[in-house]
């Protein structure tokens, strides 16, 4: 089931999903001066079954001025420099789908893609937070957020992360011991069913991953 909101915003922090659950949508957004082709997809969809998942649909952008040319080629390195999408731009590739059944890896870029990726997540998705360059983590508990279903409504748990403006970047994920958490939503649910899936496997996966560089700006 779709989460009807975006993950929480943490000042001076970005978030990243290590893998995307089936049902996740990635909007086909084009950069300024370009638009989706007339018969183009609105979004890519993580689809499949428990043994194999992949992104359905392809995003295609065409110039707003000349609408007869369609582009779908992978950007050249110089084009990628201007992008600040959710892609990990470290040498490390996202976790292979095969290692996390029912999930998709980060989709490849498409030409003239917008500078920021917009995902729509589903219940059970976990995203991980990291302070942006020039900030470091303080008073930190779990630096992640999970979309949960409670009382028939979806909500994201509050990541317990504060980023302070000291010129020192933190490792990610979890290089510090959790300290006193900032005030946030209580995570205990006593009166109704909480639907949470795939948390353990994603947490374990994240814990084994090397430090990754995030470029998403959450707005």
């Amino acid at each position: 089931e779709l989460c009807d909101d975006d993950p929480p915003e943490i000042p001076h922090a970005t978030f990243k999903a290590m893998a995307y659950k089936e049902g996740t949508m990635l909007n086909c957004e084009c950069k300024r001066g370009f638009r989706r082709i007339k018969s183009g997809s609105l979004y890519m969809l993580c689809t499949g079954n428990s043994s194999h998942s992949s992104w359905d649909n392809q995003c295609q952008c065409t110039s707003s001025a000349t609408r007869n040319t369609t582009k779908q080629v992978t950007p050249q390195p110089e084009e990628q420099k201007e992008r600040k999408t959710t892609e990990m731009q470290s040498p490390m590739q996202p976790v292979d789908q095969a290692s996390l059944p029912g999930h998709c890896r980060e989709p490849p870029p498409w030409e003239n893609e917008a500078t920021e990726r917009i995902y729509h997540f589903v219940v059970g998705q976990m995203v991980y937070y990291q302070c942006v360059q020039g900030y470091r983590a303080l008073h930190r508990g779990p630096a992640e957020s999970v979309c949960k279903m409670t009382h028939g409504k979806t909500r994201w748990t509050q990541p317990q992360l504060i980023c302070t403006g000291e010129m020192e970047t933190s490792q990610f994920p979890g290089e510090e011991k959790p300290q006193a958490s900032p005030e946030g939503r209580p995570e205990s649910e006593t009166s109704c069913l909480v639907t949470t899936t795939d948390f353990q496997i994603q947490t374990e996966m994240a814990a084994t991953m090397e430090t990754s560089i995030f470029t998403t700006e959450y707005q």
Epitope: N27, R32, I118, H120
Partner: antibody, heavy 117, light 107 residues
Amino acid sequence: EVQLVESGGGLVKPGGSLKLSCAASGFAFSSIDMSWVRQTPEKRLEWVAYISSGGDNTYYPDTVKGRFTISRDNAKNTLYLQMSSLKSEDTAVYYCARRYGLPFAYWGQGTLVTVSA
Amino acid sequence: DIVMTQSQKFMSTSVGDRVSVTCKASQNVGTNVAWYQQKPGQSPKTLIYSASYRYSGVPDRFTGSGSRTDFTLTISNVQSEDLAEYFCQQYNSYPWTFGGGTKLEIK
């Protein structure tokens, strides 16, 4: 909570003009694509117009192209639909809708436009 | 334009029953189909996206299926609050088009 409140509907003569507004709240309006959809008296649903978050790209079906113009003021969190050369077949309840993956994920309560002599 | 046909304008069912609303596209639309529920006096509410995925807050008794040209919305264990009109919609290509609607009546 997402709220979309349409206004500006009313009775107009054939050939006349009308401008609808949709006040949005509860979400980052300036980063969301928006649409207008109408529902005829026979309850048929018809997509009318679509605008990208920045307002630079717009889309219309042929039935309204050249007569209707969708626009937005992101500073005011407001979506507009300027309708001209109105016909009796434009009589409908007009809904604004926000995109959330789907083009029409969340709908307002609608405003009635009646085109009649 | 792609025509979305909901051949049954009315369907009658009882509380606890299972009912299937069908929709046929005039050409291949992949799985780019949504289903909406409109209760009397209200605006439409999204139930299903991409033919088979439940939207936010939608009870799991609503299930979507199908691809290409044939699509089905199934309501299992029908409740009295499911009294509504159900519309399919394709967003595979412009202009985006809706089915004519199927009104569900509860006996």
